[in-house]
């Protein structure tokens, strides 16, 4: 029987620009962690595997880094990051646990107050 | 276009060590993890370990953890596999294997090295 | 280390044959299976990963499927240039670790 949950960030937000750190917790069981899958929809972003270490999507290399733990770390980010993220913990003996985080990327606040004041 | 193109043919004495060479190109070296997996004669494929080129970290099968050693040169973008105390065991193709987009496999191999190892 | 049987371990077949290979693993490997066609004097290709997504360039004859334990490798009308060994691997722990092979020639 499954009767771990998984805790995450919740609905976070960023600066244009900055970095975020994606973050899951497997708690409430026993079971060992064995990989755990980070993808953005659809989209492998990382894999962090007990045995083998890390594997980052080479589409995302130039701006993922692993960590910290489990984690993951998003950088440069540009607007087009905001949406859902997933990370899927493999198990054993349990199986697989699901998390989910929403992150929205704002534009920085100098960008704002230097738009609001554009000369036409 | 994807190429990785490995050192020549390597006769080696039992107790030596062996270092072949990968050049990769055709992508960006840095952003793809690389293989290396032997093939004895006749036999069927066994995974050594994989290097991260980027930060040079390693992982090894416990079973050459002891004798075998990957690297990377990146200005060349050419990743290397030494493998030391060899024994008649150890006689078998060498292949370097890019590792894929999506995980631990491999979508890329090189045309492999043979070392044979004979006193 | 996760063990992989393959079946058959060879099998003789005709051009234009529907041929199943199977992949057997010691444990849930998840849909961490690749598959690699090999052709004597060659290097290993790959032809599918995460079990059933098709490698680019690859006919789309080829097909797999399976998860957990078990998968299987189809080969939906055998053409001149599928006559080779073919591997399975999982992609899930260390070490990673390759079936045994299974030889398809002609009938």
């Known amino acids: 029987m499954m009767t771990g949950t998984i805790e995450t960030t919740g609905n976070i937000s960023a600066e244009k620009g900055g970095s975020i750190i994606l973050q899951c917790h497997l708690s409430s069981t026993t079971a060992q962690v064995t990989q755990v899958n980070w993808e953005q929809q659809d989209q492998l972003l990382a894999i962090c595997n007990a045995d083998l270490g890390w594997h980052i999507s080479p589409s995302f290399k130039d701006r993922v880094a692993p960590g910290p733990g489990l984690g993951l770390t998003l950088q440069s980010l540009t607007v087009n990051d905001t949406g859902e993220y997933f990370c899927i913990y493999h198990t054993y003996p349990d199986g697989t646990y699901t998390g989910r985080i929403f992150l929205e990327v704002l534009e920085s606040s100098v960008a704002e107050h230097g738009a609001r004041f554009q000369i036409p | 276009e994807v190429q990785l193109v490995q050192s020549g043919a390597e006769v080696k004495k039992p107790g030596a060590s062996v270092k072949v060479s990968c050049k990769a190109s055709?992508?960006?070296?840095?952003?793809?993890?690389m293989h290396w997996v032997r093939q004895a004669p006749g036999q069927g494929l066994e995974w050594m370990g994989r290097?991260?080129?980027?930060?040079?970290?390693?992982k090894y099968n416990e079973k050459f953890k002891s004798r075998v050693t990957i690297t990377v040169d990146k200005l060349s973008s050419t990743a290397y596999m030494e493998l030391s105390s060899l024994r008649s065991e150890d006689t078998a193709v060498y292949y370097c294997?890019?590792?894929?987009?999506?995980?631990?496999?491999?979508?890329?191999w090189g045309q492999g090295t043979t070392v044979t190892v004979s006193s | 280390d996760i063990q992989m049987t393959q079946s058959p371990s060879s099998l003789s077949a005709s051009v234009g044959d529907r041929v199943t290979i199977t992949c057997r693993v010691s444990?849930?490997?998840?849909?961490?299976l690749a598959w690699y066609q090999q052709k004597p004097g060659k290097s290993p290709k790959l032809l599918i990963y995460n079990a059933k997504t098709l490698a680019e360039g690859v006919p789309s004859r080829f097909s797999g499927s399976g998860s957990g334990t078990d998968f299987t490798l189809t080969i939906s009308s055998l053409q001149p240039e599928d006559f080779a060994t073919y591997y399975c691997?999982?992609?899930?722990?260390?070490?990673?670790?390759f079936g045994p092979g299974t030889k398809v020639d002609i009938k």
């Open positions: 691997q999982h992609h899930y722990g260390n070490p990673l670790t």
């Open positions: 290097i991260d080129p980027d930060s040079g970290g390693s």
């Open positions: 055709g992508y960006t070296f840095t952003n793809y993890y």
């Open positions: 444990e849930n490997i998840y849909s961490y």
């Open positions: 294997a890019r590792e894929g987009h999506y995980g631990f496999y491999s979508d890329y």
